[in-house]
């Protein structure tokens, strides 16, 4: 799992000008086997919000357990809580639950900032407003953790929808999707629309609201505008993906490609921030700085830590850049732009100032493992996990914050060569020299 | 060094228009590093921001004041103004503007300060 | 709305005694937090900012320490000079707004 202010711890060379422009694809993607393009009953059954994560409704057991589960496409574990704890309301009681099966192993899971531990087995799994379907998946049942559960949250578990790859303790342990697509007729493909508020949200009001959508086995039309666009995932273990090009306010950054992605570019719900490696980070703030250099904010806000307020209604959007990332398209030495506005990367943050300010925290921060195009990102687009075509789609969702001057896009094709040389490749490690 | 100074009429009528400018000796009001400030303190009360400029123009005001104050720089002059309208008993007080440094975050520099009693 | 409370409101204390003023936070403003002094007639001076990196010119005897919620200024030895009233400040939540209500510091 990625490190970091990550949720739940929380949070191009040889690029030809991209001016040029390729003849748009007339002919739309085929339509796949078991897609529809309406699943009204999983439309809206995400809550919650950017900082916090977003989280689905699921039960677990016999007789069925509600409990709310982060949506984590940044890792690979089916974990619950399953102990008391001070921030959970409820948790998984294996004990009142006959279809529980013990595997008699046990998890431990590390972040830089703390931890969760608990014991495997295997129970019946369903998502109310999912699927109509109920799989035996491996649950990891949370004993033990630091850090991990968030006050106030409202999920008492994690669903990682990443590859097998990555999974705890080993990569023999089937995550979530691969049981649901293996023993069902559910494709190998789920969406997700994360829907940002805007604006600060209350307790009562996060209860409330929608916070987007988790189409599983399908898109749904209605969700986005325009055209999908799609990436191919390089490598099945995050869902890893190639940036050749990054612009601010059309501007280019002018690095060396393989910086983007130094040492990996990950599609990650779980986390909040765009988390950019250190000098692309040092690099665009820069350049934010400088595009928004009418007013001055102290080094603290660029650093995520401060808050900066306007009076309610004042935010000075327009002083703020659209930030461009190019993503490597399907067609050789084609790219496609994803934009996202202000509207995405600075956080809304609710209870610090009066209600008559609007206040927040800028939500791009530095890396070391990598970019993770997290909440801030994903909350611009509809975006389509297509697992069976190894690839992700990006289409402007139909739910981002946006003003009258400006909107989130996705645009394309442009022309990009050398593409396959962004990428990083990350020694592999001969565990025969590690020191113990 | 640079210092601050307060300026502008120790009595004002309710109702009417409180103005005071600060005017920047010693140093450049366009110096990119700082922004100016006004804070103001009731005789035996605490401090209560009113608000910040910036020499590009770029403002930032108290909420609780937002309806009434109004400040602007003036580059040429090396000064900027605090205006406050439809003052009241309650705006009586101890007017100091001052230099918000430290990374835009503290203010380390302030003036002397001026009275000004708002009274018929 | 973040508030600021500081305690004692006054404290009674002879020269070269210590003093320890309290600043706490309704909630976390990290280090985001500085020290005023100020003298009767007198315009507030800068004492710490960062919750604990002593101003230009300022004497070792001041220190500040803290972070989140609770600070607090320790004058080592107390000076003739360094009664007066002091305020905190946190800029958590920029533009810095929020002053404490003060804490006067005076001769026994």
């Known amino acids: 799992t990625q490190h970091g202010i990550r949720l739940p711890l929380r949070s191009g060379l040889g690029g030809a000008p991209l001016g040029l422009r390729l003849p748009r694809e007339t002919d739309e993607e085929p339509e796949e086997p078991g897609r529809r393009g309406s699943f009204v009953e999983m439309v809206d059954n995400l809550r919650g919000k950017s900082g916090q994560g977003y989280y689905v409704e699921m039960t677990v057991g016999s007789p069925p357990q509600t409990l709310n589960i982060l949506v984590d496409t940044g890792s690979s574990n089916f974990a619950v809580g399953a102990a008391p704890h001070p921030f959970l309301h409820r948790y998984y009681q294996r004990q009142l639950s006959s279809t529980y099966r013990d595997l008699r192993k046990g998890v431990y899971v590390p972040y830089t900032q703390g931890k969760w531990e608990g014991e495997l087995g295997t129970d019946l799994v369903s998502i109310p407003h999912g699927p109509n379907v109920t799989v035996r998946a491996n649950i990891a049942a949370i004993t033990e953790s630091d850090k991990f559960f968030i006050n106030g949250s409202n999920w008492e578990g994690i669903l990682g929808l990443a590859y097998a790859e990555i999974a705890r303790p080993d990569d023999s342990l089937e995550p979530f999707f691969d049981s649901l697509v293996k023993q069902t007729h559910v494709p190998n493909l789920f969406s997700l629309q994360l829907c940002g508020a805007g604006f600060p949200l209350n307790q009562s009001e996060v209860l409330a609201s929608v916070g987007g959508s988790m189409i599983i086995g399908g898109i749904d039309h209605s969700l986005y505008t325009g055209s999908l666009w799609y990436t191919p995932i390089r490598r099945e273990w995050y869902y890893e993906v190639i940036i050749v090009r990054v612009e601010i306010n059309g501007q280019d950054l002018k690095m060396d490609c393989k910086e983007y992605n130094y040492d990996k570019s990950i599609v990650d719900s779980g986390t909040t921030n765009l988390r950019l490696p250190k000098k692309v980070f040092e690099a665009a703030v820069k350049s934010i700085k400088a595009a928004s250099s009418t007013e001055k904010f102290p080094d603290g806000f660029w650093l995520g830590e401060q808050l900066v307020c306007w009076q309610a209604g004042t935010t000075p959007w327009n002083i703020f850049p659209v930030i461009s990332l190019y993503l490597m398209g399907e067609v050789t030495n084609q790219s496609f732009r994803i934009t996202i506005l202000p509207q995405q990367y600075l956080r809304p943050v609710e209870d610090v100032a009066t209600s008559q300010d609007d206040c927040y925290k800028f939500a791009i921060s530095q890396s070391s493992t990598g970019t993770v195009m997290g909440a801030v990102i994903m909350e611009g687009f509809y975006v389509v996990f297509d697992r069976a075509r190894k690839r992700i789609g990006f289409a402007v969702s139909a739910c981002h914050v946006h003003d009258e001057f400006r909107t989130a896009a996705v645009e394309g094709p442009f022309v990009t060569l050398d593409m396959e040389d962004c990428g990083y490749n990350i020694p592999q490690t001969d565990e025969s020299t590690l020191m113990t | 060094q640079l210092q601050l100074q307060e300026s502008g009429p120790g009595l004002v009528k309710p109702s009417e228009t409180l103005s005071l400018t600060c005017t920047v000796s010693?140093?450049?009001?366009?110096?990119?590093?700082?922004?100016w400030g006004w804070i103001r303190q009731p005789p035996g009360k605490g401090l209560e921001w009113i608000g910040n400029?910036?020499?590009?123009?770029?403002?930032y005001y108290n909420p609780s004041l937002k309806s009434r104050v109004t400040i602007s720089v003036d580059t040429s002059k090396n000064q900027f103004s605090l205006k406050l309208s439809s003052v009241t008993a309650a705006d009586t007080a101890v007017y100091y503007c001052?230099?918000?440094?430290?990374?835009?975050?503290?203010?380390?520099?302030w003036g002397r300060g001026t009275l000004v009693t708002v009274s018929s | 709305e973040i508030v600021l409370t500081q305690s004692p409101a006054t404290l009674s204390l002879s020269p070269g005694e210590r003093a320890t003023l309290s600043c706490r936070a309704s909630?976390?403003?990290?280090?985001?937090l500085a020290w005023f002094q100020q003298k009767p007639g007198q315009a507030p001076r800068l004492l710490i900012y960062?919750?604990?990196n002593r101003a230009t010119g300022i004497p070792a005897r001041f220190s500040g320490s803290g972070s989140g919620t609770d600070f607090t200024l320790t004058i080592s030895s107390l000076e003739p000079e360094d009664f007066a009233v002091y305020y905190c400040q946190q800029v958590y939540v920029w533009p810095p707004r929020t002053f404490g209500g003060g804490t006067k510091v005076e001769i026994k």
């Open positions: 001052a230099r918000l440094g430290h990374g835009y975050n503290y203010f380390d520099l």
């Open positions: 960062d919750a604990s």
């Open positions: 400029i910036y020499y590009s123009g770029s403002t």
């Open positions: 010693g140093g450049s009001i366009s110096s990119s590093s700082y922004y």
């Open positions: 909630q976390s403003v990290s280090s985001y």
